[in-house]
C-alpha cells in the first residue's frame, strides 16, 4: 500500500484558535476525525469538499474538523480565543514571496511587474486564452491573481488588462530574500520552512520521519512553530529536520538583514549596566567575578583551557575579559586568572528593576491592590475563585475576599515575600508576581534580628535515627550532579526535596542534573551500598533576590542510616551569637592532591552589625542574610560548595539555618561568611512542600 | 545523536605518516569540539589533541606536539588527524570524541566528551 504524504507541514498552526464567520454566506465543512493529520490530509486534496480548502480547525474535545474555504486574512471572517481549538491554515494562501518558480504561489497580488492590473483568468478580454480555472484544479486560477500553473521559469504571472501587453511576470519575491536573519539567527522567528537544497522541513512537534528531541512544548523560548527554520542549539545558522527520510537535518538559506532591517523579535535585551532575565544580553564591562578575583580573557587559553572561545560564540559578544553569559547559565560569568578557580559567576552585578511602571507594595505587600496579574515567570494568573479550595489548604483564617477580585496578584496568606498567585499550571501551582517593594518602604517583614526571641529549633527532644544519635550523621547532605560530575551541595529537608542555591544550575536541561545521596566521597568510592542516584524533576526558585532552589526529586528519597532529612528552623528566629556551626562540602579545598572526601568546616554565629563591622563596613545585612566566622583562619565555604547548608545545633537539634551561595568570599581570613537565612524563607519552604505535588514512592 | 566513525588506522614503520579520519554524522549540538584521545596496551586512554569546529584554537598533548596536525573539513564533516614521525610509542588504539562546548572541563579531559568513536588500531613497527 503507498504511503500517503502527510501534508500537515504545508499549514501555519495557531494554538487555541479558531475561525468565526460573521458573513452568513461562507460555507464551511465539518466531520469527525481522530488527529490533525487527517483534516490535514483532506483539505490539501481537497477531497468530497464542495470549495477549495483554505483552512481547517481542529476541535481537540470533540475530534473533529472544521474545514474552510476562507482563512484569518479574508473578509467576513474573524478570530477567536478557544481552549479545545487549533487552526491550522494552508501556508501557501498566506504567504507573500515565492518558493523555487512559485508554482505552489496562491497569494493575491493581482499587478503586474510594470505596475499593469492583472486580467481575471476567467475573462477573456482584453486577452484570449486557455488557462481556465476548470482547465486547471488545484492551481487556484482564482480572480486575477498572480500564478505559475505551470511552473515556468520567469515565476508568477498573469494576462494584463493592458490590450498592448499580453501577459508580464509579477514582482514577487523569493522568500530567501524576504527572510532575514541577525548574527546566527537564534532569535530568528521568520517563517522559511524549507532548506537550501528546497527540501521541506519537519514539524517540530512531529516525530516522523526523524525522532528529535526539540519539542515545543520542552522548549517554549525555542520558536519552534510548524516546520519553520531555527537554530536552537548555537549552529553556525538556522536549519531543520527534513521531510526526506534518508536526509536528517540541513541548513535553510536565510540571509542577514542590513543593519536597517534587523526585526528579530527575540534578542535578549542588551544592557550594560545591570542584568536582565539570565544576563545573555548583558554587554557591560565588569571584569571580574564577585569576590574581585579578574576574569581571564576569552581569546586566551591561559591559565585555563577552554572551547568557549569568541569564534565559537560570534553574537555573544565575548570580547576582552568582560562578564558574559554565551551558554544560557545562570548568570554571567567568566574564566578567572586563578589557576585553582576555573569559573565564577559575576553575581555583583545588580539586576535591571524588573518592576511593571509605578507598580510597587509596602511592607510585605498584603494590602497591594494594583491589577497586576502575571507571575514573574510569565504565567498568567488564575482566578482566585478558582482557587479558594487550595488557599483554604495552607492558610488558618478566612481571606478577605473583596480583595482577591479577579486574577489580581495578591497576597492573601501574608506571605513575607510579596503578591503571589495561582497559575492554573499543575506544575506552578502558584508563585510570585514581578512587583518590587516601593522605594524607601524599610517596613521590616521580620522584626529584632539580633535578639533570640524566636527560638529556631522545634522540639528539645534529641533526635535519634536507626540508634545514631543525628549528630554523627549527615546522611542529609546531597551531592548534585551537572553532567555527571559533582558541582554543588545540597540539604535533603524532605523526602522528596532538596535545598540548594539557584547558582548550580548552569543548563535549563533538567537531564543534565543528579542528585547524589549517602555519600562521603564526591565520586561514590566505597559508598555503592549506601548510595542513592536520583534524578531531578523540578526546580522552584526562590523569592526574588534569594538565591535559593528547592529541587524537586524525581522520586523520593529512602530515609535509611546513610539518608536523613535535616529539619528547617522556625521561621524569622534568631539564633545566639557565638553558636557554634558547621559548614559541608565537597568544594575545592585549596590542596593539589584533594581526597575528594566530605570536609566540614566550623563556624560560630556573629551578629550582623558586627559582621559589617569585619567586612570593614562595605557590606550591609538585612533580613534574609546570617553571618558566621570561622574559628581558623582560613577555613570556610568555597566554590563548588555552593548550595550546601550552615548546620547549627540549638537543643539538641541540628537545623540548617543557612545556605551557601556565591557572592562574599571564599574563606578569606578575618573576613566571616555571610549565608543565605533559611528562617527568613522558612514560611516559603514550607508553602512549596505543602503546595507542589510531588512523585509517590 | 552523533556518530563518529575513525578509519585510516594500520601498521606502519617507525618514521611514517598515517592520516587517520573521523566522519561525524548525525547531531545534538553545535559548534562542536572535536578531539584524538589513544589507548596503549595495559594503559589509560589520554588525550592526543583537539580543535574547535571552526579551528580557531588546537591543543596538543606534549608528546606529539610538532608532529600531530588535527584539521577537518567541514563541509565533509570530516576531521583528521594527521601523524608524521611516528614512534613505536604511538602504538594504541585512536579514538576520535565530540563535546559540545562548555566552562566545567578543558578540552584535553576525557569526561569533558560525551560521544566517541568505536577506534582504529595504529600500529608503528620499530
Known amino acids: 500500500q503507498r504511503k500517503r504524504r502527510n501534508t500537515i507541514h504545508e499549514f501555519k498552526k495557531s494554538a487555541k484558535t479558531t475561525l468565526i464567520k460573521i458573513d452568513p454566506a461562507l460555507k464551511i465543512k465539518t466531520k469527525k476525525v481522530n488527529t490533525a493529520d487527517q483534516c490535514a490530509n483532506r483539505c490539501t486534496r481537497n477531497k468530497g469538499l464542495p470549495f477549495t480548502c483554505k483552512a481547517f480547525v481542529f476541535d481537540k474535545a470533540r475530534k473533529q474538523c472544521l474545514w474552510f474555504p476562507f482563512n484569518s486574512m479574508s473578509s467576513g471572517v474573524k478570530k477567536e480565543f478557544g481552549h479545545e481549538f487549533d487552526l491550522y491554515e494552508n501556508k501557501d494562501y498566506i504567504r507573500n514571496c515565492i518558493i523555487g518558480k512559485g508554482r505552489s504561489y496562491k497569494g493575491t497580488v493581482s499587478i503586474t511587474k510594470s505596475g499593469i492590473k492583472c486580467q481575471p483568468w476567467s475573462s477573456m478580454i482584453p486577452h484570449e486564452h486557455s488557462f481556465l480555472p476548470s482547465s486547471y484544479r488545484g492551481k487556484d486560477l482564482q480572480e486575477n491573481y498572480c500564478r505559475n500553473p505551470r511552473g515556468e521559469e520567469g515565476g508568477p504571472w498573469c494576462f494584463t488588462s493592458n490590450p498592448e501587453v499580453r501577459y508580464e511576470v509579477c514582482d514577487i519575491p523569493q522568500c530567501s530574500e524576504v527572510e532575514c536573519m541577525t548574527c546566527n539567527g537564534e532569535s530568528y522567528r521568520g517563517l522559511m520552512d524549507h532548506t537550501e537544497s528546497g527540501k521541506i522541513c519537519q514539524r517540530w512537534d512531529h516525530q516522523t520521519p526523524h525522532r528529535h528531541k526539540f519539542l515545543p512544548e520542552r522548549y517554549p523560548d525555542k520558536g519552534f512553530d510548524d516546520n519553520y527554520c531555527r537554530n536552537p542549539d548555537g549552529q553556525p545558522r538556522p536549519w531543520c529536520y527534513t521531510l526526506d527520510p534518508h536526509t536528517r537535518w540541513e541548513y535553510c538559506a536565510i540571509k542577514t538583514c542590513a543593519d536597517n532591517t534587523m526585526n528579530d523579535t527575540d534578542v535578549p535585551l542588551e544592557t550594560t549596566e545591570c542584568i536582565q532575565g539570565q544576563g545573555e544580553g548583558y554587554r557591560g564591562t565588569v571584569n571580574t567575578i564577585w569576590n574581585g578575583i579578574p576574569c581571564q580573557r576569552w581569546d586566551s587559553q591561559y591559565p585555563h583551557e577552554h572551547d568557549m572561545t569568541p569564534e565559537n560564540f560570534k553574537c555573544k559578544d565575548l570580547r576582552e575579559n568582560y562578564c558574559r553569559n554565551p551558554d544560557g547559565s545562570e548568570s554571567p560569568w567568566c574564566f578567572t586568572t586563578d589557576p585553582n578557580i576555573r569559573v565564577g559567576y559575576c553575581s555583583q552585578i545588580p539586576n535591571c528593576d524588573m518592576s511593571h511602571g509605578q507598580d510597587c507594595y509596602r511592607g510585605n505587600g498584603k494590602n497591594y491592590m494594583g491589577n497586576l496579574s502575571q507571575t514573574r515567570s510569565g504565567l498568567t494568573c488564575s482566578m482566585w475563585d478558582k482557587n479558594m479550595e487550595d488557599l483554604h489548604r495552607h492558610i488558618f483564617w478566612e481571606p478577605d475576599a473583596s480583595k482577591l477580585n479577579e486574577n489580581y496578584c495578591r497576597n492573601p496568606d501574608d506571605d513575607a515575600h510579596g503578591p503571589w498567585c495561582y497559575t492554573g499550571n499543575p506544575l506552578i501551582p502558584w508563585d510570585y508576581c514581578p512587583i518590587s517593594r516601593c522605594e524607601g518602604d524599610t517596613t521590616p517583614t521580620i522584626v529584632n534580628l539580633d535578639h533570640p526571641v524566636i527560638s529556631c529549633a522545634k522540639t528539645k527532644q534529641l533526635r535519634v535515627v536507626n540508634g545514631i544519635p543525628t549528630r554523627t550523621n549527615i546522611g542529609w547532605m546531597v551531592s548534585l550532579r551537572y553532567r555527571n560530575k559533582h558541582i554543588c551541595g545540597g540539604s535533603l529537608i524532605k523526602e522528596s526535596w532538596v535545598l540548594t542555591a539557584r547558582q548550580c544550575f548552569p543548563s535549563r536541561d533538567l537531564k543534565d542534573y543528579e542528585a547524589w545521596l549517602g555519600i562521603h566521597d564526591v565520586h561514590g568510592r566505597g559508598d555503592e551500598k549506601c548510595k542513592q542516584v536520583l534524578n531531578v524533576s523540578q526546580l522552584v526558585y526562590g523569592p526574588e533576590g534569594s538565591d535559593l532552589v528547592l529541587m524537586k526529586l524525581a522520586r523520593p528519597a529512602v530515609l535509611d542510616d546513610f539518608v536523613s532529612t535535616i529539619d528547617l528552623p522556625n521561621y524569622g528566629c534568631t539564633i545566639p551569637e557565638k553558636t557554634s556551626c558547621s559548614v559541608y562540602g565537597w568544594g575545592y579545598t585549596g590542596l593539589i592532591n584533594y581526597d575528594g572526601l566530605l570536609r566540614v568546616a566550623h563556624l560560630y554565629i556573629m551578629g550582623n552589625e558586627k559582621c559589617s563591622q569585619h567586612h570593614r563596613g562595605k557590606v550591609t545585612l538585612n533580613e534574609s542574610e546570617i553571618c558566621a566566622g570561622a574559628e581558623k583562619i582560613g577555613s570556610g565555604p568555597c566554590e563548588g560548595d555552593y548550595g550546601g547548608p550552615l548546620v547549627c545545633e540549638q537543643h539538641k537539634m541540628r537545623m540548617v539555618l543557612g545556605v551557601i551561595v556565591p557572592g562574599r568570599g571564599c574563606a578569606i581570613p578575618n573576613r566571616p561568611g555571610i549565608f543565605v537565612r533559611v528562617a527568613y524563607y522558612a514560611k516559603w519552604i514550607h508553602k512549596i512542600i505543602l503546595t507542589y505535588k510531588v512523585p509517590q514512592s | 545523536e552523533v556518530q563518529l566513525v575513525e578509519s585510516g588506522g594500520g601498521l606502519v614503520q617507525a618514521g611514517g605518516s598515517l592520516r587517520l579520519s573521523c566522519a561525524v554524522s548525525?547531531?545534538?549540538?553545535?559548534?562542536?569540539?572535536m578531539g584524538w584521545f589513544r589507548r596503549a596496551p595495559g594503559k589509560e586512554r589520554e588525550f592526543v589533541a583537539a580543535r574547535t569546529w571552526s579551528g580557531g584554537v588546537a591543543w596538543y598533548a606534549d608528546s606529539v606536539k610538532g608532529r600531530f596536525t588535527i584539521s577537518s573539513d567541514n563541509a565533509e564533516n570530516m576531521v583528521y588527524l594527521q601523524m608524521n614521525s611516528l614512534k613505536p610509542e604511538d602504538t594504541a588504539v585512536y579514538y576520535c570524541a565530540a563535546k559540545s562546548p562548555g566552562r566545567t572541563y578543558s578540552p584535553r579531559e576525557e569526561r569533558a566528551y560525551a560521544r566517541w568513536g568505536q577506534g582504529t588500531q595504529v600500529t608503528v613497527s620499530s
Open positions: 548525525g547531531r545534538t549540538f553545535s559548534p562542536y569540539t
